[in-house]
Interface confidence: low
């Protein structure tokens, strides 16, 4: 029994509804009450869902799937995923059992995007060229973890004394934490560009310190 | 209703092969997961593996070497066959069915007991 | 491998009084699902085990409310209340976390 998955995997954004699809083709002649469908994490074996004897034996994860009964008996074996959590994410399979039996696994990509970062300065006041000053750009809230670029105003790359820190929170969403210490110029723009690599999705956040002029005794 | 009903020699004399059969009724070995459990004399329960409903099989690391989980799906079997057996393998052998709501242990089989003597 | 722990070989009560039985993981059994994979067992003198609990709180079908089950990541508790003869025999607790599967040594439940 050929059973269809997608190659790539699912997308979903954190606390929206995903649906992993699978699909088979049925002989004619085919009753659901021939049917047995599971849906479990592959690596673990846990059950997530099932359709055994004519019956939707339900959500067996958090109460949180559901199939697509009217469609079953036409082969879609898909399964819907309510309010995705990061610890959804990995490989699902479904496994498709008639007269024959089949199975194929699809992944499920969890993802969430980084807030605008805020950006502030230590220290903050009386700045002066040639001071040396630590900016912090802060984003939160994303997942998987984020890549952190920081340039000048002219768009050259800062690469050096950036230091980057991401911590999971109990949802398993990341704040993004990056510090750049540098030395004053006459005047100078600061950017820290925090990059979702799964959405590919870019925040942006940049200050802007005038330096006062220097004045000699 | 599912029933498991299991077979094989109680007794099997050392380094020999430990071969058991849990036959299943009311229910298809194609669906769900067929685990085997053994219980030694003083109530230890030790899980040693399974066989999925697509065949594929896992095994206990400390049984790794010498286990292996089978099963004919025309009649509906599951197969425990443990090799090079010692008088530590002394144990009542359980057949369980991984259930659909439960994810293990809804049905058992009514246990073998087995002695590895000469 | 989770070891599972029941410290207590065996627990008498009085028929008609309660009796709680402990377990204990050596690693929480919270999935980040939500679902605690720690079930209980009961295999009553010349039987099969047979499934009460599962998935730490849930009652399997058939078993009386007089079973429950509760605990946190890594502390359970099986309590019976209304202890009846036929409640006797070794009760095992056992997680579903990870592989291989493994159960407590077991309590033996004696009546008085």
């Known amino acids: 029994l050929e059973v269809q998955v997608p190659e790539d995997p699912v997308v979903a954004l954190v606390g929206t509804d995903a649906t992993l699809c699978c699909s088979f083709s049925p002989e004619p002649g085919f009753s659901l009450a021939q049917l047995n469908l599971i849906w479990q994490l592959t690596d673990t074996k846990q059950l997530v869902h099932s359709f055994a004897e004519g019956q939707d034996q339900g959500s067996a994860y958090a109460n949180r799937t559901a199939l697509f009964p009217d469609l079953l008996a036409q082969g879609n074996a898909s399964l819907r995923l309510q309010r995705v959590r990061v610890a959804d994410e990995g490989s699902f399979t479904c496994f498709v059992s008639i007269r024959d039996f089949g199975s194929a696994a699809v992944s499920l990509q969890v993802a969430a995007p980084y807030s605008k970062p805020s950006m502030t300065l230590e220290p903050n006041k009386d700045l002066r060229p040639g001071d040396t000053v630590t900016i912090t750009c802060s984003s939160y809230r994303g997942y998987p973890e984020a890549e952190v670029f920081w340039q000048d105003g002219q768009g050259v790359p800062l690469t050096g004394n950036v230091t980057t820190s991401q911590m999971a929170n109990e949802q398993g969403l990341f704040d993004v934490h990056s510090v750049l210490r540098v030395v004053l110029g006459a005047n100078g723009t600061y950017s820290c560009l925090v990059r979702n690599p799964v959405l590919q999705q870019d925040a942006h956040g940049s200050v802007t310190i005038t330096g006062q002029p220097m004045t000699f005794p | 209703e599912v029933q498991l009903q299991q077979s094989g020699p109680s007794l099997v004399k050392p380094s020999q092969t430990l071969s058991l059969t849990c036959s299943v009724t009311g229910g298809s070995i194609t669906s769900f997961y067929w685990n085997w459990i053994r219980k030694f004399p003083g109530n230890k329960l030790e899980y040693m593996g399974y066989i999925s409903s697509s065949g594929s099989t896992y095994y206990n690391p400390s049984l790794k070497s010498r286990i292996s989980i089978t099963r004919d799906t025309s009649k509906n079997q599951s197969y425990l066959q443990l090799n090079s057996v010692t008088a530590e393998d002394t144990a009542t052998y359980y057949c369980?069915?991984?259930?659909?709501?439960?994810?293990?242990?809804?049905?058992w089989g009514q246990g073998t007991s087995v002695t590895v003597s000469s | 491998d989770i070891v599972m722990t029941q410290s207590a070989p065996s627990v008498p009560v009085t028929p008609g009084e309660s009796v709680s039985i402990s377990c204990r993981s050596s690693k929480s059994l919270l999935h980040s699902n939500g679902n605690t994979y720690l079930y209980w067992f009961l295999q009553r003198p010349g039987q099969s085990p047979q499934l009460l609990i599962y998935?730490?709180?849930n009652l399997a079908s058939g078993v009386p409310d007089r079973f429950s089950g509760s605990g946190s990541g890594t502390a359970f508790t099986l309590r019976i209340s209304r202890v009846e003869a036929e409640d006797v025999g070794v009760y095992y607790c056992?997680?579903?976390?990870?592989?291989?599967?493994?159960f407590g040594a077991g309590t033996k439940l004696e009546l008085k």
């Open positions: 056992m997680q579903h976390l990870e592989y291989p599967l493994t």
């Open positions: 998935r730490m709180s």
């Open positions: 369980a069915r991984g259930g659909v709501h439960y994810g293990f242990g809804d049905y």
